[in-house]
């Protein structure tokens, strides 16, 4: 369970890939689209509000083998919209929603090498936000392999 309903901290940051492509958000036909692209030098990077929550649970309850605290994050690029995992479609989507947010909006934060981070679906352990064909997608990572695959690594810059 997530400890408390309010985040322990929040920060505004731009999100980019390991290869320094920017994650951008565009309003199209009354819905938001998410792009992974090289930004022109003069273009301002989109900022995302990251809200961090503590999650505390015994492994027997979570089923993910973790027996202590984890750091969960939600990502909101604009008011009332949050990134959400669509596990059926293996996609990452922006949805308008009210609090309390659904579990699909929560991701377990992993600190990685090179000061990168990864975002693992709360609803589907072993599945991470990643980059596929210049879009964000859900990517299953085999836990028997090293989790260092570059397409699930992101950089946060405030």
């Amino acid at each position: 369970s997530i400890t408390g309903i309010s985040p322990i901290t929040e920060s505004l940051a731009s999100l980019s890939t390991y290869n320094d492509q920017s994650i951008t958000f565009a309003l199209e036909d009354e819905s938001y689209e998410i792009y992974v692209e090289d930004l022109k030098k003069d273009k301002k990077k989109d900022k995302v509000l990251l809200s961090y929550y503590e999650s505390q649970h015994p492994s027997s309850e979570s089923g993910d083998g973790v027996d202590g605290k984890m750091l969960m994050v939600t990502l909101s690029p604009t008011k009332d919209f949050w990134l959400q995992a669509n596990n059926k479609e293996h996609s990452v989507e922006l949805h308008k929603c009210e609090k309390p947010l659904p579990d699909q909006a929560f991701f377990v934060l992993h600190n990685r090498s090179f000061n990168c981070v990864s975002f693992e679906c709360k609803t589907d352990p072993g599945v991470f936000i990643g980059v596929k064909d210049n879009h964000l997608a859900l990517i299953k990572v085999d836990y028997s392999e090293n989790l260092g695959s570059e397409n699930i690594l992101f950089k946060l810059s405030e």
Epitope: S11, Y52, E54, G65, V66, D67, K69, M70, V108, E145
Partner: antibody, heavy 122, light 107 residues
């Protein structure tokens, strides 16, 4: 219970190497990174590096790059820190330490070994 | 690397006193700052994480505040067991870095 048990004190000559072990128990070993922090007599805390026990990837402080090697044995839930080309300034207590959150160091380090005193003297 | 400047390096205080320790970082670290207490011959003990969250089991007389580059640890009413050395540590990026420490001594 959740604990980190370190190997015993060592006395080494300058130029030698030392290998300190840290055995974890009471938690899911591969879900938490393991950090090494040292403290010279009467001095402050100095971060040396981290190993991810899941894949074995490492991050070392620049100061120790080329002299330090961190490894792990998942079958025994043990991590090792080897420091080579020892000099007198390496005399310190060496701690292994686990972050309070799985997968992340953002929430600080809440589990520490008792420390291993390494004395470098000719 | 992020530099950590902790002040004062030592403070003399009496039981019941309010003690404030500050930590300044060379660049913004959001709220990713931890505070530790260390007693002679012992390993450090985590007191505060994420700048202001109290670690489980730590007395409520300890509190933390700040974000960005300026942070504070406050002990509202010093107790005999609080005489120790306190360290701040940034947890924002690797390498993790520590402040130089503040020794809280009996006046």
């Amino acid at each position: 219970q959740v604990q980190l048990v370190q190997s015993g004190a060592e006395v080494k000559k300058p130029g030698a190497s030392v290998k300190v072990s840290c055995k974890a128990s009471g938690y899911t070993f591969i879900s938490y990174g393991m950090h090494w922090v040292r403290q010279a007599p009467g001095q402050g805390l100095e971060w040396m590096g981290e190993i991810n026990p899941h894949g074995g990837s490492t991050s070392y402080a620049q100061k120790f790059q080329g002299r330090v090697t961190m490894t792990r044995d998942t079958s025994t839930s043990t991590v090792y820190m080897e420091l080579s080309s020892l000099r007198s300034e390496d005399t310190a207590v060496y701690y292994c330490a686990r972050p309070s959150a799985a997968y992340s160091h953002y929430l600080g380090i809440d589990l520490w070994g008792r420390g291993t005193l390494v004395t470098v003297s000719s | 690397d992020i530099q950590m400047t902790q002040s004062p390096s030592s403070v003399s205080a009496s039981v019941g006193d309010r003690v404030t320790i500050t930590c300044r970082t060379s660049q913004g670290i959001s709220s990713w700052l931890s505070w530790y207490q260390q007693k002679p011959g012992k390993a450090p003990k985590l007191l505060i994480y994420a700048a202001s969250s109290l670690q489980s089991g730590v007395p409520s007389r300890f509190s933390g505040s700040g974000s960005g580059t300026d942070f504070t640890l406050t002990i509202s009413s010093l107790q005999p067991e609080d005489f120790a050395t306190y360290y701040c540590q940034q947890a924002h990026v690797l390498p993790l870095t520590f402040g130089g420490g503040t020794k809280v001594e009996i006046k």
